[in-house]
């Protein structure tokens, strides 16, 4: 039985030009996480596997930071940014656990951010 | 340039082990993952497993498990796969290939080492 | 195991003409699939990645695209080099996978 669940930041914004931290947090099971896929709608992101380390897409390779931790730094970002993330933790032997944040590129410098989210 | 280069064939008993070796130059090999791929004759591509040299870690297809082992020696570059408990459906083509720093495509292959299994 | 399916498993075309194959996948891969081409008695060669970028010194008649399950290989003007086997293959989750290949012969 999957028990486990997923806190992440959000609903975030930022300010274009500007990086944020994508970051997701696996609690309330044992399962060992094997892998990390970042995802932003129909695009992979980064993973993170616990045994090979990063891979960055190549669409990403230029604005994407692996980090911290399970994390993701998004950098130089554009309004085109703006929509939905996902990240899907792999476990064993629970499976797969997904969990959504929604990131806001906004034009104006008063963008506001959502409480950060620390893994402690 | 980057270079793999691998053993030679080998023909070996039903039963026995034996080690393909994968040597890597033209690189910091410590900032490659190592794949190995399985190809019997006039089939298609099977993967073995990968391992990243920097740290020791492998990830192995279940089917290979028990059979295949990979290491890799980060002061002589060279990457391992030990094959055991050989048997007649062993014999084939066996590849290693490299992927460099942040990415799991892999763009260079050895040439290949082909493995006869017989008595 | 993400199974990736390839057709079709062959196919017979002529110089000029345009191939196109597919791969799809048993379950959501993202864009992690890649393109290979081995010719006999050789090495499989990167084409394509991620799953539109074309390898370094990789032709322009070649493409890919797909996102999710379903992914497609276009040649769009075969070259008598072009004549190999061409194999799909997922990194989006272990073990990674390959489809079973597509053999693309001379009508």
């Known amino acids: 039985m999957m028990t486990g669940t997923i806190e992440t930041t959000g609903n975030i914004s930022a300010e274009k030009g500007g990086s944020i931290i994508l970051q997701c947090h696996l609690s309330s099971t044992t399962a060992q996480v094997t892998q990390v896929n970042w995802e932003q709608q129909d695009q992979l992101l980064a993973i993170c596997n616990a045994d090979l380390g990063w891979h960055i897409s190549p669409s990403f390779k230029d604005r994407v930071a692996p980090g911290p931790g399970l994390g993701l730094t998004l950098q130089s970002l554009t309004v085109n940014d703006t929509g939905e993330y996902f990240c899907i933790y792999h476990t064993y032997p629970d499976g797969t656990y997904t969990g959504r944040i929604f990131l806001e590129v906004l034009e104006s410098s008063v963008a506001e951010h959502g409480a950060r989210f620390q893994i402690p | 340039q980057v270079q793999l280069v691998q053993s030679g064939a080998e023909v070996v008993k039903p039963g026995a082990s034996v080690k393909v070796s994968c040597k890597a130059s033209g690189y910091a090999f410590t900032n490659y993952l190592i794949e190995w791929i399985y190809q019997a004759p006039g089939q298609g591509l099977e993967w073995i497993g990968v391992?990243?040299?920097?740290?020791?870690?492998?990830i192995y297809n279940q089917k290979f498990q028990g059979k295949a082992t990979l290491t890799a020696d980060k002061s002589s570059n060279i990457a391992y796969l030990e094959l055991s408990r050989l048997r007649s459906d062993d014999s084939a083509v066996y590849f290693c290939?490299?992927?460099?720093?942040?990415?799991?495509?892999?763009?260079?292959w050895g040439q290949g080492t082909l493995l006869t299994v017989s008595s | 195991d993400i199974v990736m399916t390839q057709s079709p498993s062959s196919l017979s075309t002529s110089v000029g003409d345009r191939v196109t194959i597919t791969c799809r996948a048993s379950q959501h891969v993202s864009t992690a699939v890649v393109w290979y081409q081995q010719k006999p008695g050789k090495s499989p060669k990167l084409l394509i990645y991620s799953p539109s970028y074309r390898y370094s010194g990789v032709p322009s008649r070649f493409s890919g695209s797909g996102s999710g399950t379903d992914f497609t290989f276009t040649i769009s003007s075969v070259q008598p080099e072009d004549f190999a086997v061409y194999y799909c293959?997922?990194?989006?989750?272990?073990?990674?996978?390959f489809g079973g290949g597509t053999k693309v012969e001379i009508k």
């Open positions: 293959h997922q990194h989006y989750s272990t073990p990674w996978t």
């Open positions: 290939a490299g992927s460099y720093g942040s990415s799991y495509t892999f763009d260079y």
């Open positions: 391992i990243n040299p920097g740290s020791g870690g492998t």
